[in-house]
């Protein structure tokens, strides 16, 4: 089986204040098995944004269907942008498990908030 | 074996209408995005367009956009570009490609199909 | 946009680096196209993918902002113009091109 990838395609998203930002996220394999998480920042003072799992997060919505069994996209969108919300966002693949443990990040995507235009 | 074939091209006068087409097979054309794009004479690749793999969701180059439409059918395997307002810098050859999972990369290319805008 | 050199020249037999930088992509993909109106060919999709009709003789790795196409071994059939792409859509997809001649 292929070995899995996580794609962030953006570097860097730039978004104005009050505005949705789409932050992008493919894998190219099914395997392994387990959710997708999407964090801010990194090591342990990182902040959950979004688990496939739980929820409700609500202001994060998923671009695709991700409750399709063959899906691989999993962008989210996070609405009403604040400049709390500047960040790197990591897209990371968990392995199934007592507990899920991580398995692979992708390369992480920086926002950053413009202010909001007069 | 992946095939791309895109219809003939041709030539056409500034502000008409052309349409082309790319017939797909040997791979799972529903479950793909497919992307048009093309190359002037002695210029490199210019992406302009590519559709979501049920066609909901279309994306486009600035230079084409409000000119061009792309569009697909999927039962019959088969990917389209809609050109109107047609402008000698639209002259080029145009190739139909298959998406990977990431729709920026392409896998499979057509041999691409020439379209000259002259009067 | 993204950045690669004009051309390069490899010996026959010999490796050839070709780069990629800048832009806003984390990922890079290159393609290959032997005479200009031919068809480009896949050679490399998402940093390190190589399509199954592919020589292993071509490999890519990505660091950072910079994406190299390696060929390892380099043939005469192997000159051509050598495009990357990016996977931001902001980057306009392609590089202008590395045109490699054979010496």
């Known amino acids: 089986e292929e070995e899995l990838q996580i794609i962030q395609p953006d570097k860097s998203v730039s978004v104005a204040a009050g505005e949705s930002a789409i932050l992008h996220c493919t894998i190219t394999s099914l395997f392994p098995v387990g959710p997708i998480q999407w964090f801010r920042g990194a090591g342990p003072a990182r902040v959950l944004i979004y688990n496939q799992r739980q929820g409700p997060f609500p202001r994060v919505t998923t671009v695709s269907e991700t409750t399709k069994r063959e899906n691989m996209d999993f962008s989210i969108s996070i609405s009403n942008i604040t400049p709390a919300d500047a960040g790197t966002y990591y897209c990371i693949k968990f392995r199934k498990g007592s507990p899920d443990t991580e398995f692979k990040s992708g390369a992480g995507t920086e926002l950053s908030v413009r202010a909001k235009p007069s | 074996d992946v095939q791309l074939v895109e219809s003939e091209g041709g030539v056409v006068r500034p502000g008409e209408s052309l349409r082309l087409s790319c017939e797909a097979s040997?791979?799972?054309?529903?479950?793909?995005?497919m992307t048009w794009v093309r190359q002037a004479p002695g210029e490199g690749l210019e992406w302009v367009s590519t559709i979501s793999d049920t066609g909901d969701t279309a994306y486009y180059a600035d230079s084409v956009k409000g000119r061009f439409t792309i569009s697909r059918d999927n039962s019959k395997n088969s990917l389209y570009l809609q050109m109107n307002s047609l402008r000698a810098e639209d002259t080029a050859i145009y190739y139909c490609?298959?998406?990977?999972?990431?729709?920026?990369?392409?896998?499979?290319w057509g041999l691409g199909t020439l379209v000259t805008v002259s009067s | 946009a993204l950045t690669q050199p004009a051309s390069v020249s490899a010996n026959l037999g010999g490796t050839v680096e070709i780069t990629c930088s800048g832009g806003?992509?984390?990922?890079y993909g290159w393609y290959q196209q032997k005479s200009p109106g031919s068809a480009p060919v896949t050679l490399i999709?998402?940093?390190?993918n190589r399509p199954s009709n592919i020589p292993s003789r071509f490999s890519g790795s990505t660091s950072g902002s910079t994406s190299t196409l390696t060929i390892t071994g380099v043939q005469a059939e192997d000159e051509a113009v050598y495009y990357c792409g990016g996977s931001s859509t902001g980057d306009g997809i392609f590089g202008a091109g590395t045109t490699l001649t054979v010496l």
């Open positions: 806003n992509s984390n990922h």
């Open positions: 490609a298959k998406s990977w999972i990431w729709w920026t990369f392409f896998d499979y």
């Open positions: 999709y998402a940093d390190t």
């Open positions: 040997g791979f799972t054309f529903r479950n793909s995005y």
